[in-house]
């Protein structure tokens, strides 16, 4: 049920129809605050960005692909298997798990376009879903019924 | 079911360069698990999706705009001001705050295109950053220096 017509030129389609400029709007990482000074430490800070103050702290890992829009994606990586105690900010509490929250993000890949006779005609953007981890969340473990 | 007609070249832009194909990949919302049965309750469940098992539980609120791609975005809304106790799953612990994690997501808006003489020439896709709240995170409150 295509609501928006196709962009890659199909047979008999005018290539000037559907255009997306590969613009240079920066895409900042998920958490725009200051990065964790001790990215690998399993502790909850009392200052700094959300990901370092969380009791399920995480760091961001860059995933760059120059043939993708956005070119830069960031994946959260949990720094602790369990949640950190709210009291101390350092001891782990085995009653809570630090779990990744995932999201299937829409991205666009640059692919060669082919004209009517199979000739290369510039580039198409191909829409895809790309799984990214957004954050680590402190959760109660599942109780199996 | 074509809702968005054509995109158009801007002045001096090679029309065959960047074309966008609308394939039919579904774009699921953030958290693919079972929704919270009591969406407004400030408690951490022992089953269900991540957003209901979190000690900083949240619900999702739909933000729909038919002139945007993706048309549907989901904003997290925290169900508790503080974190829920890992032990009970219901009592709040004032030592922890439930804070929203924000992200500037890349979206595309449908805008009228204008030809060289200012004439309307179909529609262009305009890339923008759009602020969404992804999740609620249990954090230690900031200690002001």
């Amino acid at each position: 049920y295509s609501h928006w017509p196709s962009c890659c030129p199909s047979k008999g389609q005018d290539t000037s129809e559907e255009l997306l400029r590969w613009s240079t709007v920066p895409v900042p990482p998920l958490e725009p605050a200051r990065p964790n000074r001790h990215p690998e430490s399993c502790r909850a800070s009392e200052d700094g960005p959300l990901n370092s103050r969380a009791i399920s702290p995480w760091r961001y890992e860059l995933d760059r692909d120059l043939n993708r829009l956005p070119q830069d994606l960031y994946h959260a990586r949990c720094l602790c298997p369990h949640c950190v105690s709210l009291q101390t900010g350092s001891h782990m509490d085995p009653r809570g798990n630090s779990e990744l929250l995932y999201h299937n993000q829409t991205v666009f890949y640059r692919r060669p376009c082919h004209g009517e006779k199979g000739t290369h005609k510039g580039y198409c953007l191909e829409r895809r879903l790309y799984r990214v981890s957004l954050a680590c969340v402190c959760v109660r473990p599942r109780v199996m019924g | 079911y074509s809702h968005w007609p054509s995109c158009c070249p801007s002045k001096g832009q090679d029309t065959s360069e960047e074309l966008l194909r609308w394939s039919t990949v579904p774009v699921p919302p953030l958290e693919p698990a079972r929704p919270n049965r009591h969406p407004e309750s400030c408690r951490a469940s022992e089953d269900g999706p991540l957003n209901s098992r979190a000690i900083s539980p949240w619900r999702y609120e739909l933000d729909r705009d038919l002139n945007r791609l993706p048309q549907d975005l989901y904003h997290a809304r925290c169900l508790c001001p503080h974190c829920v106790s890992l032990q009970t799953g219901s009592h709040m612990d004032p030592r922890g705050n439930s804070e929203l994690l924000y992200h500037n997501q890349t979206v595309f808006y449908r805008r009228p295109c204008h030809g060289e003489k200012g004439t309307h020439k179909g529609y262009c896709l305009e890339r923008r950053l759009y602020r969404v709240s992804l999740a609620c995170v249990c954090v230690r409150p900031r200690v002001m220096g």
């Epitope: 049920y1 295509s2 609501h3 928006w4 | 079911y1 074509s2 809702h3 609308w22 039919t24 990949v25 579904p26 774009v27 699921p28 919302p29 953030l30 958290e31 693919p32 698990a33 079972r34 929704p35 919270n36 969406p39 999706p49 957003n51 619900r59 999702y60 609120e61 739909l62 729909r64 038919l66 002139n67 791609l69 048309q71 549907d72 989901y74």
Partner: antibody, heavy 121, light 107 residues
Framework: EVQLQQSGPELVKPGASMKISCKAS????????MNWVKQSHGKNLEWIGL????????SYNQNFKGKATLTVDKSSSTAYMELLSLTSEDSAVYYC???????????????WGQGTSVTVS | DIQMTQTTSSLSASLGDRVTISCSAS??????LNWYQQKADGTVELLIY???SLHSGVPSRFSGSGSGTDYSLTISNLEPEDIATYYC?????????FGGGTKLEIK
């Protein structure tokens, strides 16, 4: 074949609450949002809200916030609407309706339940 | 909220007639308009989506047109089973809103 089977008619007392169910079959329940619509006096149709079974994400008509609560049970492919603190104004036929989606875009309520009549008296 | 108005609340026509039902929006809705048919037993079916696209299984005698704020549904050759109430609905912006309905009867 897509089918939405709603629960039967209800007679309820003023001040009470009640829950209407809508069991979906013939399609993947989590792939489509579910809308709820009120029809008073056999005429006007009013959109109540929608829920996405995939993540429980909701959107409500302001006129029904605090009156209707939408939930789903993914395991039984059933959508629910709870109506709270009922008054005579809530007497109506309530419909669930699947929202058509082509993998990108929403377009219409393409399949409707048979309706559930609620009488508050 | 966007208001949808169906000025004609009831309409009488003869079998075989061409019937047009109109609907107007309080602001431009960019063709995001659907038409539904409700039979006397309460059954509701989608006829037309996005102003003019025919839903699967709907007879080709039904068609839709319009733009901006003004839209219409046309039945080219009225059949007995078309006796029903017809509603327009905008989906340009939430909350979705419906017209008041036009009841179609046989002369």
């Amino acid at each position: 074949e897509v089918q939405l089977q709603q629960s039967g008619p209800e007679l309820v007392k003023p001040g009470a609450s009640m829950k209407i169910s809508c069991k979906a079959s013939g399609y993947s329940f989590t792939d489509y949002t579910m809308n709820w619509v009120k029809q008073s006096h056999g005429k006007n149709l009013e959109w109540i809200g929608l829920i996405n079974p995939y993540n429980g994400g909701t959107s409500y008509n302001q006129n029904f916030k605090g009156k209707a609560t939408l939930t789903v049970d993914k395991s039984s492919s059933t959508a629910y609407m709870e109506l709270l603190s009922l008054t005579s104004e809530d007497s109506a036929v309530y419909y669930c309706a699947r929202e058509g989606y082509d993998g990108y875009l929403y377009f219409a309520m393409d399949y409707w339940g048979q309706g559930t009549s609620v009488t508050v008296s | 909220d966007i208001q949808m108005t169906q000025t004609t609340s009831s309409l009488s026509a003869s079998l075989g007639d061409r019937v047009t039902i109109s609907c107007s929006a309080s602001q431009g809705i960019s063709n995001y308009l659907n038409w539904y048919q409700q039979k006397a037993d309460g059954t509701v079916e989608l006829l037309i989506y996005y102003t003019s696209s025919l839903h699967s299984g709907v007879p080709s005698r039904f068609s839709g047109s319009g733009s901006g704020t003004d839209y219409s549904l046309t039945i080219s050759n009225l059949e007995p089973e078309d006796i029903a109430t017809y509603y327009c609905q905008q989906y340009s912006k939430l909350p979705y809103t419906f017209g008041g309905g036009t009841k179609l009867e046989i002369k």
